[in-house]
């Protein structure tokens, strides 16, 4: 006999990286018929939802109106059908950004390179941090972690057209508190014409909504959203 229900999905909308003082919604998707959802923060109960009518609802939303460092951390959710509880969801790392300062991102030998050339990004921040994060914008959400007293280097090695795209970096004061994002650096990799034309480029965020990759479809893409965030979140652990 089944002792627990399948674990729910958890994700943040519009994104798990939240600028300070901005709002975010933590979503938990379980099963139709769930009479209670619980959201846990760092292992302690944070909020409870008892959806009505439960048989018509399989997703609940926990609204956080004003993101700050006290709200940043690891969240998980569970749900109950009758007296039977689910397994806990995966952990959601909610990160507060736009803390303190803005790093500078540069690229060597430059933003326009030839396929096969070695490229290194440099992220510099003069305040007290020793961990840096380099993110390539787009759905694949590539994240690299680097270390250094005031600067970290991110060698990409010999690049291909798949490395094309817009990059930003953050200084990290702890796992869940990041600096303002750097200004974007767009890397242009040219190869032979055939390769260049065929290489798909990640969709990038609009310049004014960086970091808020919106998934407006309620079904189908939610798991993609969780998987997409998962790449970046693994670096936080």
């Amino acid at each position: 006999q089944q002792q627990t229900l399948p674990k729910p999905f958890i994700w943040a909308e519009p994104h798990f990286m939240v600028p300070k003082e901005k709002q975010v919604t933590i979503c938990c998707q379980g099963n139709y018929g769930a009479v209670e959802y619980q959201l846990h923060f760092e292992g302690s109960l944070f909020a409870v939802d008892r959806p009505k009518p439960p048989e018509r609802i399989n997703k609940v939303q926990f609204y956080i109106p004003d993101m700050n460092s006290r709200m940043a951390g690891q969240y998980s959710c569970i749900y109950r059908v009758g007296e039977l509880w689910s397994e806990p969801s995966n952990l959601l790392d909610l990160v507060v950004t736009e803390m303190y300062d803005t790093p500078t991102l540069s690229v060597h030998p430059g933003p326009e390179v030839i396929s096969g050339e070695k490229v290194t990004f440099y992220c510099r921040l003069d305040t007290a941090t020793s961990m840096f994060l380099l993110l390539k914008e787009g759905r694949s959400s590539h994240v690299q972690r680097g270390y250094g007293k005031v600067q970290a280097e991110f060698p990409l090695g010999p690049v291909t057209t798949a490395h094309r795209g817009t990059y930003r970096c953050f200084g990290s004061y702890n796992n869940h508190a990041w600096s303002f994002p750097s200004e974007p650096v767009k890397l242009l990799v040219t190869g032979d014409i055939e390769n260049t034309s065929l290489a798909p480029e990640d969709p990038t965020f609009p310049a004014d909504t960086w970091g808020t990759y919106l998934l407006t479809t309620e079904t189908g893409l939610q798991k993609d959203h969780a998987l997409w965030d998962h790449t970046a979140q693994n670096l936080l652990r």
């Epitope: 909020a47 939802d49 009505k52 609204y63 006290r70």
Partner: nanobody, 130 residues
Framework: EVQLVESGGGLVQPGGSLRLSCAVS????????MGWFRQAPGKGREFVAA????????YYADSVKGRFTISRDNSKNTAYLQMNSLRAEDTAVYYC???????????????????????WGQGTLVTVSS
């Protein structure tokens, strides 16, 4: 400016009852989840009870379940905590709290963590003693 003002505290004998009130001004009370917390002498702040803005969901700490009842009257911008069968260990300063932000809260959500609340009252003392 947001103001939360508790009232109704006092001295009561074990087994007795009290009703605490929390009047809220300066916010759109009717769409805000609310909570009650308490702090006993020499101890940390402890969750007591919470209520969704629609009153459809209430949630209680195990230590008060079956004895305390949280309610609200949105037309009066007031939340209540009815406390029955009071015990000596219920002695504490009781605080009401309101979540922050705008009107985007689900009608069925309650918050149990103190960090989720933005605005707090000054507290009212409840003493249970014979």
């Amino acid at each position: 400016e947001v103001q939360l003002v508790e009232s109704g505290g006092g001295l009561v004998q074990p087994g007795g009852s009290l009703r605490l009130s929390c009047a809220v001004s300066g916010r759109t009370f009717s769409r805000l989840p609310m909570g009650w917390f308490r702090q006993a002498p020499g101890k940390g702040r402890e969750f007591v009870a919470a209520i969704s803005w629609s009153s459809s969901t209430t949630y209680y700490a195990d230590s008060v379940k079956g004895r305390f009842t949280i309610s609200r009257d949105n037309s009066k911008n007031t939340a209540y905590l009815q406390m029955n069968s009071l015990r000596a260990e219920d002695t504490a300063v009781y605080y009401c709290a309101a979540v922050g932000g705008s009107l985007d809260y689900s009608a069925t959500v309650v918050y149990t963590a103190a960090r989720a609340y933005a605005d707090w009252g000054q507290g009212t003392l409840v003493t249970v003693s014979s």
